[in-house]
């Protein structure tokens, strides 16, 4: 089991962690489709970590901790995109992440929304090993770009996010 | 048209990993806009979705399954895979691959179906 | 259990019409569009209507879907002794166990 989040650092007792959902307006897009703007929440925060240097033979205690700013609860929800000229495809579902409520969690574990994971292969085919962050894309950074080579209706997809609501 | 056929064992011992492949024909995998599916039905009983894969390899879980499930593709032989770990009696089914059109509630095409019986 | 609230069963004389209903909640059928698959026994699941309430090319008009609130329906006409079958409900949930949903199923008996 993941060792719970630190809230203090007894060397920063001033100091505390903290994790909160940010609204921001995401564009969802898919090639050869009208995107179409929503509005989300990223994941946003300073959760402590820290090293401390070990010892032979090793204390009992941990001496590595990391948390994460990540989605809490989130669910799937389509977003149906509108793609002129596109006969045999008209018109594109995507799913995408919406998210409910962050907090800081574990660095390695799987974030703790009781949605639906997704793992995603690079474009070099099955067997390649998915990134040990459960999510096609990290979790956005107000202002920054999550592109994808290849555009799945079904992945999440960021194309910018604006500032916040 | 496009066309849908399941194929792997049809008796799998209790603990082991149930592997099925769903080969594609009248139609290119990697074609885009649609999903590639795995449903199953227990016997008697009614429908149940297991995933979908995009040919880029992205896959969808259901969660009730997702700690047992690996679903893979392979757009070079045009089919797609399921792995289902440690199975037991509850998961015997007829299990069936489909294809998912560009509206992810629009089962469009299915395969004939593959009865897989779990037992010692 | 289903996601998706279905009758067991309904049974109508031919030529006559049954409905079925499918219920559901806000984060599925409220929210998203509804399709209809039609079992014949033996074989696999067919695409009957999608989109709440629209057919695919060769489905004759018999057969009709609808979308009201959290609940969908079926209707088909003229009933056939062919029509003897399992009717499945299915949508997208995205409740926080999010996922593609079906109804229980119902079998149609032509009496």
């Known amino acids: 089991a993941a060792p719970p989040p630190i809230n203090k650092l007894a060397l920063f007792p001033d100091k505390s962690a903290w994790c909160e959902a940010k609204n921001i307006t995401q564009i969802v897009g898919h090639s050869g489709c009208e995107a179409k703007s929503i509005q989300n929440r990223a994941c946003l925060g300073q959760c402590f970590s820290y090293s401390v240097p070990n010892t032979f033979p090793q204390s009992t205690e941990s001496l590595v901790h990391c948390d994460s700013c990540m989605p809490a609860q989130s669910m799937w929800e389509i977003v149906t995109l509108e793609c002129p000229g596109h006969e045999e495809v008209p018109r594109v579902d995507k799913l995408v992440e919406k998210i409910l409520h962050c907090s800081c969690q574990a660095c390695g574990k799987e974030p703790s929304h009781e949605g639906l994971s997704v793992y995603v292969q690079g474009e070099d085919g099955p067997g390649s090993q998915p990134g040990t962050h459960p999510h096609p894309h990290p979790h956005p950074h107000p202002g920054g770009q999550t592109p994808e080579p290849e555009d799945p209706p079904g992945a999440p997809h960021t194309e910018e996010e604006g500032a916040e609501d | 048209e496009v066309q849908l056929l399941e194929s792997g064992p049809g008796l799998v011992k209790p603990s082991q990993t149930l592997s099925l492949t769903c080969t594609v024909s009248?139609?290119?995998?990697?074609?885009?806009?649609?999903?590639w599916s795995w449903i199953r039905q227990h016997p008697g009983k009614g429908l149940e979705w297991i995933g979908y894969i995009y040919y880029s390899g992205s896959t969808y879980y259901n969660p009730s399954l997702k700690s047992r499930v690996t679903i893979s593709v392979d757009t070079s032989k045009n089919q797609f895979s399921l792995k289902l770990s440690s199975v037991t009696a509850a998961d015997t089914a007829v299990y069936y691959c489909a294809r998912t059109n560009s509206r992810i509630t629009m089962i469009a095409d299915w395969g004939q179906g593959t009865l897989v019986t779990v037992s010692s | 259990q289903s996601v998706l609230t279905q009758p067991p069963s309904v049974s109508a004389a031919p030529g006559q019409k049954v409905t079925i209903s499918c219920s559901g909640s806000s984060s599925n059928i409220g929210n998203n569009y509804v399709s209809w698959y039609q079992q014949l026994p033996g074989t696999a699941p067919k695409l009957l209507t999608y989109d709440n309430n629209k057919r695919p090319s060769g489905i004759p008009d018999r057969f009709s879907g609808s979308k009201s609130g959290t609940s969908a329906t079926l209707g088909i006409t003229g009933l056939q002794t062919g029509d003897e079958a399992d009717y499945y409900c299915g949508t997208w949930d995205s409740s926080l166990s999010a996922g593609h949903v079906f109804g229980g199923g119902t079998k149609v008996t032509v009496l």
């Open positions: 009248g139609g290119s995998i990697s074609s885009g806009g649609y999903y």
